[in-house]
Interface confidence: low
């Protein structure tokens, strides 16, 4: 019988008492085969973290800073359940740390040196750790003691709880530096008052502070937020302009064998029986013998943290950067106006080889990082392990939802000023063999399908989106008799046609022979009835243009396109017979790397782009002989996006809507994780 006990870690007598009450009340409402609670008492949160790592306890609820400690080796804990605040309809699991300024003050984030600062309190998250952590490498050396470096950075501050004797500048704006509400500039409201009164130029608070202190919109309009990209935004645009997004209070468990499903089952049942306004005898979110015991008193309930989410993703790149800077105290040697090498994310073995070659040729401008799937690459870019990669539109959507931005677009047509003119897009088509003359768009049920990969534009999002509108369900593996859609569940019929061997079968990378445009077309040639690809795929792989044994004798005339009106047309008539227009592939990166990725890639394409005439003796960025490694092989150049610099603007309203509709059918664990951070 599996052990269904969750050992909760308590850090005080009062917590232990509440834990025992929790245990006893759960016993009274949960059947004997359900989850149960046991209580383990430790002296501190850090002791609890160590106990969970050592399998002496299973769960504890932590503030964000401690979630970071819990994640670090050798603890390796992960977030499993989040407390939420506000309503069930609009649950808030995060708050945003922001820098508020007066509208007419005219300076940006990178011009804070010499300004006067208002902090909620020394060592507090939004008011100190995050802003000072992010500014850490701009502080004058020596950076230790930190208070002295901060005092020398700003021209005056109010940082309640600081030592006013040793660091008088930190108390200059609030005589005494008192560490309670007796100090009028203490806490969130106090720091904002410090700004409002004109004592300081910037207040480091959380996003809700300004709304809690100024009910009137006209008054709020006198203030702005400083953004990390050195712009300003109105105070209600905090989701797009903040220093960090911080989880409020989170249950953590072991990453391996951590009982995360059991913990969720327990807490989900607990909130049903003892949540807000549920029971008189025992209340989960109330602490009669103290404050915030086991859980925050202000919490309204729990949400399950998506399994794909590790602590780094949960805490977010900015928060992790700030805390790491403070803890490790290391700053890069290079001057900050110089671009560091761009870490390119390469998918599996084949892309890695090409990337390594690029890296050597780039003389230190490009470095390579490997991942096995596109989603793993996106996650690495999010957390700073990698910086950039080129993505199909379907993944540009997921990357955008995860906070990444498009920076350059692949262009596929030769033109005089290629780099200045991003194209409208390519065509997503459905290809069949000419010999299968009875096959149309309207009778695909039961046929064998070939897809570039799950989540990609031409191979999945467009055809399956259209199909979904017709069949109104997501069981595509039942609609087609079998197929190859790399990235599907291994036991799905949509992996049956795939050709990868062993663990590589149906993997969404080049280890699966039927992956990508060329792979999907090969699948059609060898096994399938229909392939969902781009309009250039057939001509690129017929007429001897692809020397592979399976392709060398193929003839374009032996294939036709399926049109949405039920007719068929020759391959060259794609403009009048396609499923939809697809946005070109685009390079994505984090917002903080946007300028450098843009600059370095423009240099790289001038060295190794389409202007290289002989690819047999030289490195060519846009060539991999039909394998589309790192970039599509038909890329002519990488083009500027001009104002299409967000994923919504880049992909266009129509495509975003189409992918949004298909979200019901999404198997993307990363998309689920990212929409948890930003619904």
């Amino acid at each position: 019988v599996p052990d269904k006990t969750v050992r909760w870690c308590a850090v005080s007598e009062h917590e232990a008492t509440k834990c025992q009450s929790f245990r006893d009340h759960m016993k009274s409402v949960i059947p004997s085969d359900g989850p149960s609670v046991a209580c383990v008492k430790k002296a501190s949160y850090l002791d609890c973290i160590r106990a969970i790592a050592a399998n002496e306890a299973d769960a504890v609820t932590l503030d964000a800073g401690l979630v970071y400690d819990a994640y670090l080796a050798p603890n390796n804990l992960k977030p499993v359940v989040a407390e939420f605040y506000g309503s069930k309809e609009d649950p808030q699991t995060f708050y945003y740390a922001v820098a508020v300024v007066k509208k007419d003050s005219g300076f940006q984030m990178n011009q804070l040196r010499g300004k006067k600062s208002c902090h909620t309190g020394l060592g507090r998250s939004a008011g100190w750790n995050i802003p000072i952590g992010l500014l850490y490498c701009d502080l004058p050396e020596p950076r230790k003691p930190l208070e002295k470096a901060v005092a020398n950075f700003f021209s005056g501050s109010c940082a309640p709880c600081a030592d006013g004797t040793d660091f008088p500048q930190l108390c200059q704006l609030c005589p005494g530096c008192g560490c309670s509400t007796l100090n009028q500039y203490f806490g969130y409201s106090g720091a904002f008052k410090c700004l409002k009164d004109g004592a300081g130029d910037v207040a480091f608070v959380k996003h809700s502070t300004i709304f809690e202190n100024l009910a009137n919109k006209a008054d709020r309009d006198q203030y702005e937020l400083l953004c990390l990209d050195n712009t300003r935004k109105p105070v209600d645009e905090y989701k797009d302009c903040h220093l960090a997004q911080v989880p409020s209070h989170t249950v953590v468990a072991r990453s391996m064998g951590g009982k995360e499903d059991l913990i969720w089952e327990l807490l989900n049942q607990a909130q049903e029986h003892f949540g807000k306004d549920k029971s008189k005898e025992f209340q989960l979110f109330s602490s009669p013998h103290g404050k915030d015991l086991l859980f925050k008193d202000s919490a309204h309930g729990f949400l399950k943290v998506p399994p794909r989410m590790d602590a780094k993703m949960y805490l977010g790149y900015e928060y992790v950067t700030a805390i790491r800077n403070l803890r490790e105290g290391t700053c890069p040697e290079a001057p900050t106006d110089e671009c560091k090498p761009v870490k390119w994310c390469a998918l599996s073995h084949h892309e890695r080889l090409k990337c390594d070659e690029w890296s050597v040729n780039s003389v230190g401008k490009i470095e390579c990082v490997s991942a096995e799937t596109t989603e793993d690459c996106i996650a690495k870019i999010m957390n700073g392990e990698a910086d950039a990669m080129s993505l199909d539109g379907g993944f540009v959507y997921i990357a955008g939802k995860c906070g990444l931005v498009p920076v350059l677009a692949e262009n596929y047509n030769k033109s005089d000023n290629c780099e200045d003119t991003p194209e409208a897009g390519y065509f997503a088509i459905a290809v069949v063999k000419k010999s299968a003359s009875d096959l149309t768009w309207d009778n695909l049920k039961g046929k064998k399908s070939c897809h570039t990969a799950v989540g990609r534009t031409a191979g999945w999002n467009i055809p399956m989106g259209l199909l979904y509108n017709k069949i109104n369900h997501c069981r595509f593996d039942e609609f087609f008799s079998e197929g190859c859609a790399p990235g599907s569940k291994k036991d799905s019929s949509l992996c049956k046609l795939c050709m990868g061997s062993g663990l590589n079968l149906c993997e969404p990378n080049n280890k699966e022979g039927y992956y990508g445009y060329t792979g999907a077309f090969r699948c059609l040639v060898e096994k399938g009835d229909v392939a969902f690809v781009k309009h250039q795929t057939v001509p690129q792989n017929t007429g001897g243009k692809n020397p592979d044994p399976w392709a060398k004798n193929l003839n374009e005339k032996d294939y036709e396109l399926l049109c949405l009106d039920g007719t068929r047309k020759p391959v060259e008539e794609y403009a009048n017979c396609h499923l939809a227009r697809a946005p070109n592939h685009a390079v994505v990166t984090r917002k903080d790397k946007e300028a450098c990725v843009h600059k370095i890639l423009r240099q790289q394409q001038h060295l190794f782009g389409s202007n290289v005439t002989d690819c047999s003796g030289n490195f060519c960025l846009f060539r991999s002989e039909t394998k589309d490694l790192l970039f599509r092989d038909d890329t002519v150049c990488l083009a500027k996006l001009h104002d299409r610099n967000t994923y919504e603007k880049y992909l266009g309203e129509e495509y975003v809507k189409a992918v949004g509709n298909l979200r019901k059918c999404s198997t993307s664990s990363l998309l689920e994780a990212c929409t948890f951070r930003r619904p």
């Epitope: 073995h349 084949h350 080889l353 070659e357 061997s501 080049n510 280890k511 699966e512 022979g513 992956y515 792979g519 020397p547 592979d548 044994p549 399976w550 690819c615 047999s616 003796g617 030289n618 991999s624 002989e625 039909t626 394998k627």
Partner: nanobody, 122 residues
Framework: QVKLEESGGGLVQPGGSLRLSCAAS????????MGWYRQAPGKEREVVVG???????NYADSVKGRFTISRDNAKNTVSLQMNSLKPEDTAVYYC????????????????WGQGTQVTVSS
Amino acid sequence: QVKLEESGGGLVQPGGSLRLSCAASGNVFTIDAMGWYRQAPGKEREVVVGMTNGGKTNYADSVKGRFTISRDNAKNTVSLQMNSLKPEDTAVYYCYARSKLIATINNPYDYWGQGTQVTVSS
């Protein structure tokens, strides 16, 4: 297919020298570049140096001035002369060849040998 066979690894003291050789056989007419990459335990693979048929070379910064690649196109061999070796050069060294005829996914266009261990230690 192209088959690659390395020789010449071994144990050497810091500051010492080693020469690695690699012989290519099979579809050698398809090769348009050869070189070496290395992998140290628990580290990412790193390209050490590559050389095209035309003689263009690219060295990793960490080995510049210490390692020299040479190729004999007639004999289809590539050699790596490693001087002033350091403990951080310890790794398995793989010879690789790049093909201008891109074959199928299961027959990759880059080929590599079994690897030869180089250990720099006193």
